[in-house]
């Protein structure tokens, strides 16, 4: 089952999946000036069986101006820009993804892909949070979020992480011991948290999702 929304956003933090559950989709997005090839895949899909998982489909980008040039090679280092949800720098090596049954490792880059990878996760996916450079983590509990199915609806658990503006970076799980606290907020049992682009967390939008998530008007 696909999760109905993206993981919650925490101010001054980014998240990363160490491995991707089967069923995860990675959009075939191209950087500005390029587009998916005609008849190309819309997304890559993590598929497989209990012993081996891999990404189905290939993403290919072509110049918006040139019709018949398609490339699919590894970008040069200067093209390897930060991707918000996938390639955050950390001195720690991720867990051995190959050892996780039913999971895919990070797909290799394709030429002229967008600078940010957009994943659509499935129930059971876990993502880990860390504070961005220049912020320090204050843990109330696990700095992770899991997509869960409750009463037929999907929701992400709330990571117990606060990032404060002290010049010290925190790392992915394993780098520092989370400080479990009895005062930590209990995760919501009602709905997924909803996020906006300015990182303000909103918690009252579940009813909106039930009916219509768009309003349309004309001028």
């Amino acid at each position: 089952e696909l999760c109905d929304d993206d993981p919650p956003e925490i101010p001054h933090a980014t998240f990363k999946a160490m491995a991707y559950k089967e069923g995860t989709m990675l959009n075939c997005e191209c950087k500005r000036g390029f587009r998916r090839i005609k008849s190309g895949s819309l997304y890559m899909l993590c598929t497989g069986n209990s012993s081996h998982s891999s990404w189905d489909n290939q993403c290919q980008c072509t110049s918006s101006a040139t019709r018949n040039t398609t490339k699919q090679v590894t970008p040069q280092p200067e093209e390897q820009k930060e991707r918000k949800t996938t390639e955050m720098q950390s001195p720690m090596q991720p867990v051995d993804q190959a050892s996780l049954p039913g999971h895919c490792r990070e797909p290799p880059p394709w030429e002229n892909e967008a600078t940010e990878r957009i994943y659509h996760f499935v129930v059971g996916q876990m993502v880990y949070y860390q504070c961005v450079q220049g912020y320090r983590a204050l843990h109330r509990g696990p700095a992770e979020s899991v997509c869960k199915m409750t009463h037929g609806k999907t929701r992400w658990t709330q990571p117990q992480l606060i990032c404060t503006g002290e010049m010290e970076t925190s790392q992915f799980p394993g780098e520092e011991k989370p400080q479990a606290s009895p005062e930590g907020r209990p995760e919501s049992e009602t709905s997924c948290l909803v996020t906006t682009t300015d990182f303000q967390i909103q918690t009252e939008m579940a009813a909106t999702m039930e009916t219509s998530i768009f309003t349309t008007e004309y001028q």
Epitope: D5, E29, C30, R35, S39, H120
Partner: antibody, heavy 104, light 110 residues
Framework: PGGSLRLSCAAS????????MNWVRQAPGKGLEWVSY????????YYADSVKGRFTISRDNAKNSLYLQMNSLRAEDTAVYYC??????????WGQGTLVTVSS | QSALTQPASVSGSPGQSITISCTGT?????????VSWYQQHPGKAPKLMIY???NRPSGVSNRFSGSKSGNTASLTISGLQAEDEADYYC??????????FGTGTKVTVL
């Protein structure tokens, strides 16, 4: 006929900038017709032949908004216009729609 | 781009199973596994029932299933219920990087 309109679609409840968006319309008593597509960043755009050169799709991710600028309107553009979010190969969430009537 | 072909109407009694077909070409239905199905009640926005040929979104009853063979996709509704009475549309991604919808099928529960 010949006039212009701009449709707006305000999205909430999901991370708008992570999704490709579309406009779909439905003339009164008729079926659904796909109108236009825009990628999550706004860098890639496609139109149905019936609106190409007249309609312009755009988005403002900072405002969680999708737009459709409609110029040189014709009577056959009369329809309910829906904005729709794409995930996978389908449109998984739809707006409630707005009726556009083109008449003299 | 021509609309995908669907039967204008399909009917069945409560508890029965019905199948709606959606026929396209190798440039749309036959060329991709990006076929989706939508339910639309009068005056309402469409609702996604099946995506990528056979996948059900969360919250959609498992009475709805999808399949594809060649250039034809199918939606099957088993254990037909009164609330299933609605219009149903198929859709497919195309080789032009656009989308095309079906002509629509009115489902009547007798």
């Amino acid at each position: 006929p010949g006039g212009s309109l701009r449709l707006s679609c305000a999205a909430s409840g999901f991370t708008f900038s992570s999704y490709e968006m579309n406009w779909v319309r439905q003339a009164p008593g008729k079926g659904l017709e796909w109108v236009s597509y825009i990628s999550s960043s706004g860098s890639t755009i496609y139109y149905a032949d019936s609106v190409k050169g007249r309609f312009t799709i755009s988005r403002d991710n900072a405002k969680n908004s999708l737009y459709l600028q409609m110029n040189s309107l014709r009577a056959e553009d009369t329809a309910v216009y829906y904005c729709a979010r794409r995930r996978g190969g389908g449109f998984d969430y739809w707006g409630q729609g707005t009726l556009v009537t083109v008449s003299s | 781009q021509s609309a995908l072909t669907q039967p204008a109407s399909v009917s069945g009694s409560p508890g029965q199973s019905i199948t709606i077909s959606c026929t396209g070409t190798s440039s749309d239905v036959g060329g991709y596994n990006y076929v989706s199905w939508y339910q639309q009640h009068p005056g309402k926005a469409p609702k996604l029932m099946i995506y990528d040929v056979s996948n059900r979104p969360s919250g959609v009853s498992n009475r709805f299933s999808g399949s594809k063979s060649g250039n034809t996709a199918s939606l099957t509704i088993s254990g037909l219920q009164a609330e299933d009475e609605a219009d149903y549309y198929c859709s497919s991604y195309t080789s032009s990087s656009t989308y095309v919808f079906g002509t629509g099928t009115k489902v009547t529960v007798l």
